[in-house]
């Protein structure tokens, strides 16, 4: 997802199908201000950026909107009116997934039931992960709709659970970027609770002198 | 098994025409997902990804061909096409239809035609 | 566009050997970056999907890496039925863009 041109590193993320944003870091460029300007069509004129992202009061990126028809990012980095990086590219390659929204479980004996609402476009991936004390590891379970079911749990114990959205690899490419995780919830006997103990790390074996 | 069959290439005039087939076969062209794409292999064995046009309709040129050319379908024929204008020499080539790999556009190419060679000369 | 340089362009080899071929790309490009063969009188194969993955069909000697700008595709213990020009393709840049192809010849 970066990608290089005289000395500017480049990183493209196209969050939910809604807003590009470009970021770089330009280390030939310490103390410019780069522009950044764009199109979504090779025959419309380029347009300025008109919300940069600053950092240490320098421009590093760009967000722009966009619409599910943009297909095509056209843009250009510059210092002054001299180009210092050009490129067009497939939006979707560096799709971003929003949290899941509405987030409900619901148990039954011993399993889970997650939902939530579906994403407006397809070609994803939910997936929720939970794990108990005991477990050192996340277990993992994902379904095509934002409707996983986990089972074989005991309800006994305590378990924590998040869950994301993922672009699927067949559809956009293998160089997505999956969703920030929702917020951990923990669920024991049913009900929430404000959290699980932590999970039991193995003892270190005590070396012989 | 998608199979996919050009049609419509010989020997055309500089300034000229020509309008290129491609029957498809095993697959149908409107799946939804699914693009469909011209790429030309000039003499050299230089290969140039011309455009593709979707399961949609939607199409897409390479912009240093966009002006001169035009892909379209006929749903019912499951055929696309590739109309092309103002031949020049240099666009002597053979040129295949390809399938995209995945359901999207911008991937690889995983099923190809046989070619069809376009000589453009006087 | 991306710009995909190829090295190799010529390559003799003995059956069994181990061959590599390099793809550079003028940006980076992440992993999408697919390889194909083409052998005399044939239209081209896809060989490699995204860098390194497989294509059902395709012998196991051939494989493939890299991410970036810096790519390879390996045939590992080459047959005589592997003479054939290869092309490297990227994918996320517009337009779509090929090597220019290396010429693998087996003495």
């Known amino acids: 997802q970066v990608a290089t041109g005289e000395g500017l590193q480049i990183q493209i993320m196209y969050f939910n199908l809604e807003t590009v944003q470009v970021t770089w870091n330009a280390s030939h460029y310490p103390r410019s201000n780069l522009s950044f300007h764009y199109k979504f069509s090779r025959d419309e004129a380029y347009d300025q950026c008109t919300v940069y992202i600053l950092q240490e009061g320098h421009t590093s990126g760009c967000l722009l909107d966009a619409e599910q028809q943009d297909d095509i990012l056209y843009f250009s980095i510059r210092n002054g009116t001299h180009p210092v990086f050009t490129a067009s590219r497939w939006i979707f390659y560096y799709l971003k997934p929003s949290s899941p929204k509405q987030v409900s479980f619901s148990w039954h004996q011993d399993a889970v039931t997650l939902t939530c609402s579906d994403l407006s476009y397809r070609g994803l991936l939910y997936e929720v992960q939970y794990r108990s004390p005991f477990d050192t590891e996340w277990q993992s379970k994902q379904e095509n709709t934002c409707n996983v079911t986990v089972e074989d749990l005991d309800a006994e114990k305590c378990y924590a659970f998040r869950a994301r959205v993922k672009a699927m690899e067949d559809a956009y490419g293998p160089d997505t970027y999956p969703s920030d995780w929702s917020e951990v919830t923990c669920w024991q006997r049913g009900e929430t609770r404000d959290s699980c103990p932590e999970p039991r790390t193995p003892p270190k074996p005590k070396l012989s002198k | 098994q998608v199979q996919l069959v050009e049609s419509g290439g010989g020997l055309v005039k500089p300034g000229g025409s020509l309008r290129l087939s491609c029957a498809a076969s095993?697959?149908?062209?409107?799946?939804?997902?699914?693009?469909w794409t011209w790429i030309r292999q000039f003499p050299g064995k230089g290969l140039e990804w011309m455009g593709y046009?979707?399961?949609?309709?939607?199409?897409y040129y390479n912009p240093a061909l966009k002006s001169r050319i035009t892909i379209s379908r006929d749903n019912a024929k499951n055929s696309l096409y590739l109309q092309m204008n103002s031949l020049r020499a240099e666009d002597t080539a053979v040129y295949y239809c390809?399938?995209?790999?995945?359901?999207?556009?911008?991937?690889?190419?995983?099923?190809w035609g046989q070619g069809t060679l376009v000589t453009v000369s006087s | 566009e991306i710009v995909l340089t190829q090295s190799p362009d010529f390559q003799s080899v003995t059956p069994k050997e181990k061959v590599t071929i390099t793809c550079r790309a003028s940006?980076?490009?992440?992993?999408?970056l697919h390889w194909y063969q083409q052998k005399p009188d044939q239209s081209p194969k896809l060989l490699i999907k995204?860098?390194?993955r497989s294509i059902s069909g395709v012998p196991s000697r051939f494989s493939g890496s890299g991410s970036g700008t810096d790519f390879t595709l390996t045939i590992n213990s080459l047959e005589a039925e592997d003479a054939a020009t290869y092309y490297c393709?990227?994918?996320?840049?517009?337009?779509?863009?090929f090597g220019q192809g290396t010429k693998l010849e087996i003495k």
């Open positions: 390809a399938r995209s790999l995945y359901g999207g556009y911008k991937d690889a190419f995983d099923s």
């Open positions: 095993g697959f149908s062209i409107t799946t939804s997902g699914y693009y």
């Open positions: 046009i979707g399961y949609n309709s939607k199409t």
């Open positions: 940006q980076s490009i992440g992993t999408s």
């Open positions: 995204f860098a390194s």
């Open positions: 393709q990227q994918s996320p840049g517009f337009p779509p863009t």
